[in-house]
């Protein structure tokens, strides 16, 4: 599932290159392993911002699929309470390209620990 999430992120990156989206997104660029589920939640919430900003059906579908895949992969530990982690709003705001690069990085963390 996580490998498919990366494929979807690459697809989103390709799709948004043909658009002009100026959004800045809360981005965790240095994820601590003990906060990775919290960080993933922030990435997924911000991904919905991209979908709404784009107004593009392909991006919308890809974001939904990515969320479905991530949800299923995290169904066993998605409700784990991680303490001492930053709230989404406390994260640095970055452009979409940097956001997606950081997203791929956190997904790779999940792949490496699964």
């Amino acid at each position: 599932n996580w490998v498919n999430v990366i494929s979807d992120l690459k697809k989103i990156e390709d799709l948004i290159q043909s658009m002009h989206i100026d959004a800045t997104l809360y981005t965790e660029s240095d994820v601590h392993p003990s906060c990775k589920v919290t960080a993933m939640k922030c990435f997924l919430l911000e991904l919905q911002v991209i979908s709404l900003e784009s107004g593009d059906a392909s991006i919308h579908d890809t974001v939904e699929n990515l969320i479905i895949l991530a949800n299923n992969s995290l169904s066993s530990n998605g409700n784990v309470t991680e303490s001492g982690c930053k709230e989404c709003e406390e994260l640095e705001e970055k452009n979409i390209k940097e956001f997606l690069q950081s997203f791929v990085h956190i997904v790779q963390m999940f792949i490496n620990t699964s």
Partner: antibody, heavy 122, light 112 residues
Amino acid sequence: EVRLMASGGGLVQPGGSLRLSCAASEFTFSNYAMSWVRQAPGKGLEWVATISRGGDYTYYPDSVKGRFTISRDNSKNTLYLQMNSLRAEDTAVYYCARRVSLITGGWAMDYWGQGTLVTVSS
Amino acid sequence: DVVMTQSPLSLPVTLGQPASISCRSSQSIVDITGNTYLEWYQQRPGQSPRLLIYKVFNRFSGVPDRFSGSGSGTDFTLKISRVEAEDVGVYYCFQDSFVPYTFGQGTKLEIK
């Protein structure tokens, strides 16, 4: 008023195939994901398949995966369910349903068609 | 897979009296983004299912306010404040937080 009209049901032998259709009207079909749900005689509801707005993504339970294929033709406002290798336990009324989008407020099947009966028997 | 268990399976109610249906999931259906995708559907005799409640407590348009949903995590409830004759049918809870999406077995509401 949203309208969904399922058709294509009938009697088919075990191992056979059938294609169901669902004609949609009174809404912008391409703006919604769609699902099929079935109900065996006298039994409860079972989710069968879901397809994304553009048709690129499909989802199934293990009970039908590899045998059933959901697809759509947005130019014809029509949803399909291709059912192969049919079994007696696939006998049911099949409903098509419109699925509200996650991005626009959460998932739910907000409108349902009237259903079409599929009977698998020799 | 998430198993949805409803109780009671049969619910005889006097007209004008309240009714309550419970739905329990085998694991939490709160998704990673903090949302709970739990719906309630009504199926009147001989009819197609109809959406009543989505995301635990949101009433769908046109649904009378005597219907209400509540709950969190793994325990959910559908309440009818005063049962009317048109409420007869089978009620299903449904989760679509995780694939495969799953229904409860259904609760048959009948008039005493």
